[in-house]
């Protein structure tokens, strides 16, 4: 994980003839802002993918008013950096798009309008943790000067932010098999994080989250000793009568030696005999150099200038393994939030968001009623990623634009006749009934079931329903 940072230095007219007119005027003051979109890889297909590495929008710059007759100068810029966090490995090669937008501060209805002044794009190689890279891009008559870098978020380090580093426990050296973390020589490369609770003495892992047992130990966390005292053989049978525990798999079961190495058991563990060109505890380090092109699927090879120094493949999104040979099912990590549908397009990950949510990972909960107008005095009611209008009397439909027929639901009881009225409806009750909806019978002695008839109304009079 890490952050891509973009610093805009200047935006103004480029050199040469045909200087652009200022985008702002005394009549129409404006301010600038920028947006950056990042995509992994240098391939042509990156142009067709969405901003899979992320995107960021700057703050608005200071308000600028052009002085009449003056040439367009470099325009005032927003403060601060544009920062695009990335969660996975930094791909090493990337494509960018930087948009320069103008926000006009006149009296437009519906808020200030935006216009796109310039859009620049490029493809670059960049190692994480390196210095700021400077760039100049031209779009028409405009020129944009900027710097960028990628930096890892601790504890990640390295040119792809894939290595983890921890402060050194002993002052002089790192633990067995662990290298110092260049350039942080006072830190050590962290070991793989095994399954939580995996015994540090009797378990080990080759993949994060697993726990494999050394000989003599078993159980999910390698904490259960295998009893051999009454078993038929050192790796005795599973038997309830003998009291033997089922041993874990033997240390050579499944062949832990990579790259065609052969495994032999030792009293404590195992030993790999590696084929020529490979070395390491599990033959995982090869004498192959980057010149041999060992990284598949567009992986970026780093180090390994000679056979005695290991190379590392920095894999593009969607691939993993020491040589980027394995395809990752990135949707299994459920990156889309709020019920979004995950689509692994190969070159990019895409989330299709449910109504009411947006963002690259559906992380933004949109205000259901923002910008939603309910007509004819209706009010907007939020709910469940959608909006609905609670309409004033006499109106209906999604946005309260339709005139409702108040008599459609036959609201007058006991055979009363319904008449539409500008303020609602009126019921003309049949003889023997009264009330706003003719719901009350009139008793024979002239009294009604109502506590009291409204003053000025006789039973049988039309009653307006308000």
């Amino acid at each position: 994980a890490g952050v891509f940072e973009l610093q805009i230095h200047s935006f103004g007219p480029g050199p040469g003839p045909g200087a652009p007119r200022s985008p702002c005027s005394a009549r129409l003051p404006c301010r600038l802002f920028f947006r950056v979109c990042l995509k992994p890889g240098l391939s042509e297909e990156a142009a067709e993918s969405p901003c899979a590495l992320g995107a960021a929008l700057s703050a608005r710059g200071p308000v600028y008013t052009e002085q009449p007759g003056a040439p367009a100068p470099d325009l005032p810029l927003p403060d601060g950096l544009l920062q695009v966090p990335f969660r996975d490995a930094w791909p090493g090669t990337f494509s960018f798009i930087i948009e320069t937008w103008r926000e006009e501060l006149g009296d437009q209805i519906g808020g200030p309008a935006w216009s796109l002044l310039a859009r620049v794009a490029g493809r670059r190689r960049l190692a994480a943790g390196g210095p700021w890279a400077r760039d100049i891009q031209r779009a028409g008559a405009w020129e944009l000067r900027f710097s960028y870098r990628a930096r890892c978020e601790p504890p990640a380090v390295g040119t792809a932010c894939t290595r983890l580093c921890r402060p050194r426990s002993a002052p002089s050296r790192c633990g067995p098999g662990l290298r110092p973390c260049a350039p942080l020589e006072d830190e050590c490369e962290a070991p793989l994080v095994c399954r939580a609770g995996c015994s540090p003495e009797h378990g080990f892992c080759e993949q994060p989250g697993e726990c494999r047992c050394l000989e003599g130990w078993t159980g999910p966390l390698c904490t259960v000793p295998v009893s051999t005292s009454s078993c038929l053989s050192p790796r005795g049978p599973s038997s309830a009568t003998t009291g033997c525990l089922v041993p874990g798999p033997g240390p050579c079961d499944g062949n832990p030696c990579a790259n065609g190495g052969s495994c032999s058991e030792t009293p404590r563990s195992f030993e790999c005999t590696c084929p020529r060109g490979f070395y390491g505890l599990r033959c995982e380090v090869s004498g192959v150099t980057c010149a041999d092109g060992p990284c598949f699927n567009g992986g970026l090879c780093v180090g390994g200038a000679d056979p005695d120094s290991a190379y590392i493949c920095h894999c593009p999104p969607g691939f993993q393994g020491s040589n980027c040979e394995k395809r990752v099912d990135r949707c299994s990590l459920q990156p889309c939030r709020n019920g979004g549908l995950c689509l692994d397009l190969g070159h990019a990950l895409r989330c299709r968001c449910r109504a009411g949510f947006a963002g690259p990972r559906c992380e933004h909960d949109l205000d259901d009623c923002a910008g939603r107008a309910c007509a004819n005095g209706g009010t907007c009611v939020e709910g469940g990623g959608a909006h609905r209008c609670s309409c004033a009397l006499g109106f209906g439909g999604r946005d309260c634009r339709e005139r409702a027929d108040p008599c459609a639901a036959r609201p007058c009881a006991h055979g009363g006749r319904c008449y539409a009225h500008f303020s609602g409806l009126v019921c003309a009750c049949a003889p023997g009934y009264m009330g706003a909806r003719c719901e009350f019978p009139v008793h024979p002695d002239g009294a009604s079931a109502l506590p009291a008839a409204p003053p000025g109304l006789r039973p049988g009079d039309p009653q307006r329903y308000l």
């Epitope: 947006r35 929008l57 808020g111 910008g371």
Partner: nanobody, 127 residues
Framework: QVQLVESGGGLVQAGGSLRLSCAAS????????MVWFRQAPGQEREFVGG????????AYADSVKGRFTFSRDNAKNTGYLQMSSLRPDDTAVYYC????????????????????WGHGTQVTVSS
């Protein structure tokens, strides 16, 4: 799924006007950026402008500012592009596009950010 159908294109004299419509069906699109791109023969698809997903505000390419206006009628699920003072270099196929992203700020000016597209309508401006 969202289906988009453009209409209103045709042949017009320089200085004239046209109004293009983009009718959306399949899902309510009030939460979508609805924008227009154009593509002249042999050229890349170019952002023209449209309305943002977030608040419906208009966004323009600088080259059409003051001549083109964008609007939408959410009740009819339709977006409009009103073009006036047309010039011969406005000749192109005009495409309507829609997407829920980005959730704030102006709509994207990049074609790859849009999932839904119409088939386009031809606008020819003669001199």
């Amino acid at each position: 799924q969202v289906q988009l159908v453009e209409s209103g294109g045709g042949l017009v004299q320089a200085g004239g006007s046209l109004r293009l419509s983009c009718a959306a069906s399949g899902r309510t699109t009030s939460r979508y950026s609805m924008v227009w791109f154009r593509q002249a023969p042999g050229q890349e698809r170019e952002f023209v402008g449209g309305n943002s997903a977030h608040d419906g505000r208009s966004a323009y390419a600088d080259s059409v500012k003051g001549r083109f206006t964008f609007s939408r009628d959410n009740a009819k699920n339709t977006g409009y592009l009103q073009m006036s003072s047309l010039r011969p270099d406005d000749t192109a196929v005009y495409y309507c596009a829609a997407d829920t992203n980005p959730p704030y700020g102006p709509p994207w000016s990049t074609p790859s950010e849009y999932e839904y597209w119409g088939h386009g309508t031809q606008v020819t401006v003669s001199s």
